[in-house]
Amino acid sequence: TIPPHVQKSVNNDMIVTDNNGAVKFPQLCKFCDVRFSTCDNQKSCMSNCSITSICEKPQEVCVAVWRKNDENITLETVCHDPKLPYHDFILEDAASPKCIMKEKKKPGETFFMCSCSSDECNDNIIFSEEYNTSNPDLLLVIFQ
């Protein structure tokens, strides 16, 4: 079991336990910060990030941000707490096992963001509409 001296002196945001006292391990996410990317006009892309990190806090999830402007395309991969906005946007899909990109309104650029909660899930970023549960045909399949 967990040594009692660990439980007594830790910060609440650094340790999450269940009813049996087992401690939740943080998410494993791709974490390359901002890198130039060749991902463009594709249904899905791999991050090409070779760094997988243990997120700092157990509540953090994996995030990917794809940005395109007149000069370049970048892909950002990080861990982030879904209770806090990222780039001024709420992480609505943080519980999703897949990183399904959603467009956000940002002046002067095309901006897509996704978040997810499975191992290295921000390695495979999905733009295709067929994965989007706002698609009525997909909802029909799910609920049949």
Epitope: T1, D18, N20, G21, A22, V23, K24, F25, P97
Partner: nanobody, 124 residues
Framework: EVQLLESGGGLVQPGGSLRLSCAAS????????MAWARQAPGKGLEWVSL????????YYANSVKGRFTISRDNSKNTLYLQMNSLRAEDTAVYYC?????????????????WGQGTLVTVSS
């Protein structure tokens, strides 16, 4: 009864190295992911490194990447943490921990058994 016993801690100068060991007993060691965590004085618990059951996949916190190496010897039921280029901020009690369930995949990892810890002090 599951038991985890850490050893190898001590006082080391900045830039030095230490190798921590964790002897495991009471469970089928090679079926479980294992991890190292640490707690600095007055600070929260920080997960340092994770290793898959067979030892082929390893993961690290950004704070130790490139300096620490996790490994395991399943024939000896022992987990290791090689710590190089140690810094003052690495001073902490280091714990090894066993994952609660042997399942892999995308289930939430929870760790239910811990050693009593070994103190690492980095100071000149």
């Amino acid at each position: 009864e599951v038991q985890l016993l850490e050893s190898g801690g001590g006082l080391v100068q900045p830039g030095g190295s230490l190798r921590l060991s964790c002897a495991a007993s009471g469970f089928t060691f090679f079926n479980y992911e294992m991890a190292w965590a640490r707690q600095a004085p007055g600070k929260g618990l920080e997960w340092v490194s994770l290793i898959s059951a067979e030892g082929t996949r390893t993961y690290y916190a950004n704070s130790v990447k490139g300096r620490f190496t996790i490994s395991r010897d399943n024939s000896k039921n022992t987990l290791y943490l090689q710590m190089n280029s140690l810094r003052a901020e690495d001073t902490a009690v280091y714990y090894c921990a066993k994952r609660r369930d042997a399942s892999m995949g995308h289930t939430t990892r929870r760790f239910d058994h811990w050693g009593q810890g070994t103190l690492v002090t980095v100071s000149s």
